[in-house]
């Protein structure tokens, strides 16, 4: 099989995030530039016919063209050690250093990069490159989709005809890897909350690095953290009212630790919402703020949004709980003009408290108004 | 989930043509080289051709140069193999496969030469 | 033409112990700073080939990790550590390094 999508997220992975060069013409730039171009030809044999292929060369030519990078030089030395693919191992470790990803990750180079994506309330998302969204996504959609780990939620109506939705259930495939956990599910419905996974066990079953998946319970029926060691990863799953909520820590090289673009690279969390599933609520925050609850039946995704919740008092429940005026505070705000349903807040104050404990940039725990963003 | 289903095979005489077809879903089918891949009755697999994503290049095996032509229509997610002054040893199942190194496959179709 | 040579010829082995197959090419099959294209196929009685194995020793998605292959250069193994019924068959080598592509002619595997 082709593999010129791991040569795309090393280079994606060398030149953003924390450790990316300071400016695109950067000898730093231009040296990850010479590392793509020379991936992509290791890997013409097996992709010489596919688009990704092509994309991929023409992409490094207009690139080293654009920024003037020699083709000789030097090339970056890859930031990121390699994943094998799951259960591509092909000799045993006795050693639980492999199911430690930061362990092993540090004998090769820097920390690892670590993402964020969470989802909540009506629902909003926030995805893994900080791009925050209002969706409509009714039924199942998968919210991650890669080589490790498969998370899929199925989202229900807020109220009868509303376009509005919110998570009442969630379903995590963590997938068979090497020497450190056989696969395991778990899954959370309305009223719900395990903390264990479908077979009743706790972690990663009888392999030697089986306490690298672990699952523990932070408030009965209300709040559960999966820790996945071996891919550096960290789950919250909240109940909060009738409602679920999900966020995530997670590397960048696991992020993109996709076979196949075309039918995993869809998820969620890495591409946003399809544009046809997105609410402009920025739209209809600033209808609502000029003309009060009464206009709301011609921004609101929910026709049958109570009027009994005036704006005013939406506003003061939220600041109480949000008091920065991000967007956390303002999906608050909608979520509780288009529901009525004041858990709504606590939905919006718990993502936020997760944003705080999950995001690896503290500088970009708040996300202010602007343009709505396009898929990725 | 990937499916290529084949078509087209049949009895036909030695120096006649025919037009295999593979009919793909599961995946973008104009992003990917697709093969085809032939087997003789019980013998193993001999490479026949593939195709670029776009029909820009196209590879053959010796034995069908000149003979066989491969093509797509990307609108249609179908892949064609036209056989031209068809011999008696092409009697085989052809396969078509997608990528540019074939990962999955078709069930493939039998193909007889014969007078 | 690259030849792949493949042994043995057929191979009967019991459930549970391990089979072993090898295939030698007529050149080496390294491409690039060691990036080497040799795959392996499973053809199941009355089925298509399904892929195992590509770039030597990369388990194809879905495949056991009993499916081990490892090898360099023009030598390349296949070992079954535990051998179970769905896994007779034909296994066929197949190089994508040089044009055109080759397969090897086929290591049948048979339950003892």
């Known amino acids: 099989p082709c593999k010129i999508l791991k040569c795309n997220s090393e280079f994606w992975s060398a030149t953003s995030g924390s450790h990316a060069p300071a400016s695109d013409d950067t000898p730093e730039f231009c040296a990850a530039l010479r590392s793509y171009a020379l991936c992509t030809r290791r890997t013409a044999r097996t992709c010489r016919g596919d688009l990704a292929y092509h994309s991929a060369v023409h992409g490094i030519e207009d690139l080293m063209s654009q920024h003037n990078c020699s083709k000789d030089g030097p090339t970056s030395q890859p930031r990121l050690r390699t994943l094998p693919p799951a259960g591509d191992s092909q000799e045993r470790s006795d050693s639980p250093e492999i199911c430690h990803y930061e362990k092993s990750f540090h004998k090769h180079s820097a920390t690892p990069n670590y993402t964020h994506c969470g989802l909540f309330g009506d629902p909003h998302l926030r995805t893994f490159t900080d791009r925050f969204q209002t969706c409509k996504v009714q039924g199942a959609w998968p919210l991650i989709d890669n080589n490790y780990l498969n998370v899929q939620v199925t989202n229900t109506p807020v109220l009868p005809g509303s376009a509005a939705t919110a998570t009442s259930k969630l379903t995590i495939i963590f997938k068979n890897f090497q020497e450190c956990v056989d696969q395991k599910v778990y899954q959370a419905e309305m009223d719900e909350l395990p903390a264990a996974f479908v077979d009743g066990s706790k972690n990663g079953g009888d392999k030697h690095g089986a306490n690298s998946l672990k699952i523990t319970e932070k408030v009965s029926g209300q709040h559960v953290e999966i820790q996945a060691k071996y891919i550096g990863t960290t789950i919250v799953v909240r109940q909060v009212g009738r409602y679920l909520t999900f966020a995530v820590r997670m590397p960048e090289e696991v992020v993109n630790a996709v076979e196949d673009w075309d039918s995993q690279g869809l998820y969620l969390c890495l591409r946003g919402c399809p544009l046809n599933q997105q609410i402009d609520f920025q739209a209809f925050h600033t209808n609502a703020e000029g003309t009060g609850a009464r206009r709301l039946a011609a921004a609101s995704p929910a026709p049958t949004a109570p009027e009994t919740f005036p704006y005013e008092t939406a506003v003061a429940k939220c600041k109480e709980k949000l008091p920065v005026e991000d967007l956390y505070y303002q999906a608050c705000v909608f979520d509780l003009l288009t529901t009525g349903d004041v858990n709504f807040t606590l939905a919006a104050y718990y993502a936020l408290e997760d944003v705080k404990m999950l995001h690896s940039n503290k500088d970009k725990l708040h996300l202010y108004e602007r343009t709505r963003d396009l898929p990725g | 989930e990937v499916q290529l289903v084949e078509s087209g095979g049949g009895l036909v005489q030695p120096g006649s043509s025919l037009k295999l077809s593979c009919v793909a879903s599961g995946f973008t089918f104009s992003n990917y080289g697709m093969n085809w891949i032939r087997q003789a009755p019980k013998k193993g697999l001999e490479w026949i051709g593939m195709?670029?994503?776009?029909?820009?290049?196209?590879h053959y095996a010796d034995s069908v140069k000149g003979r066989f032509t491969i093509s797509r229509d990307n609108s249609k997610n179908t892949l064609y193999l036209e056989m031209n002054s068809l011999r008696s040893e092409d009697t085989a199942i052809y396969y078509c496969a997608k990528g540019t190194t074939p990962d999955y496959w078709g069930q493939g179709v039998m193909v007889t030469v014969s007078s | 033409d690259v030849v792949l040579t493949q042994t043995p010829v057929s191979l009967s082995v019991t459930l549970g112990d391990q089979a072993s197959m090898s295939c030698r090419s007529s050149?080496?099959?390294?491409?690039?700073?060691?990036?080497?294209?040799l795959e392996w196929f499973l053809q199941k009685p009355g089925q298509s080939p399904q892929l195992l194995i590509y770039e030597v020793s990369n388990r194809f998605s879905g495949v056991p990790d009993r499916f081990i292959g490892s090898g360099s250069g023009t030598d390349f193994t296949l070992k079954i550590s535990r051998v179970e019924p769905e896994d007779l068959g034909v296994y066929y080598c197949f190089q994508a390094t040089h044009d055109p592509l080759t397969f090897g002619s086929g290591t049948k595997l048979e339950i003892k």
């Open positions: 050149q080496s099959l390294e491409y690039s700073d060691g990036y080497t294209f």
């Open positions: 195709i670029y994503y776009d029909s820009s290049e196209k």
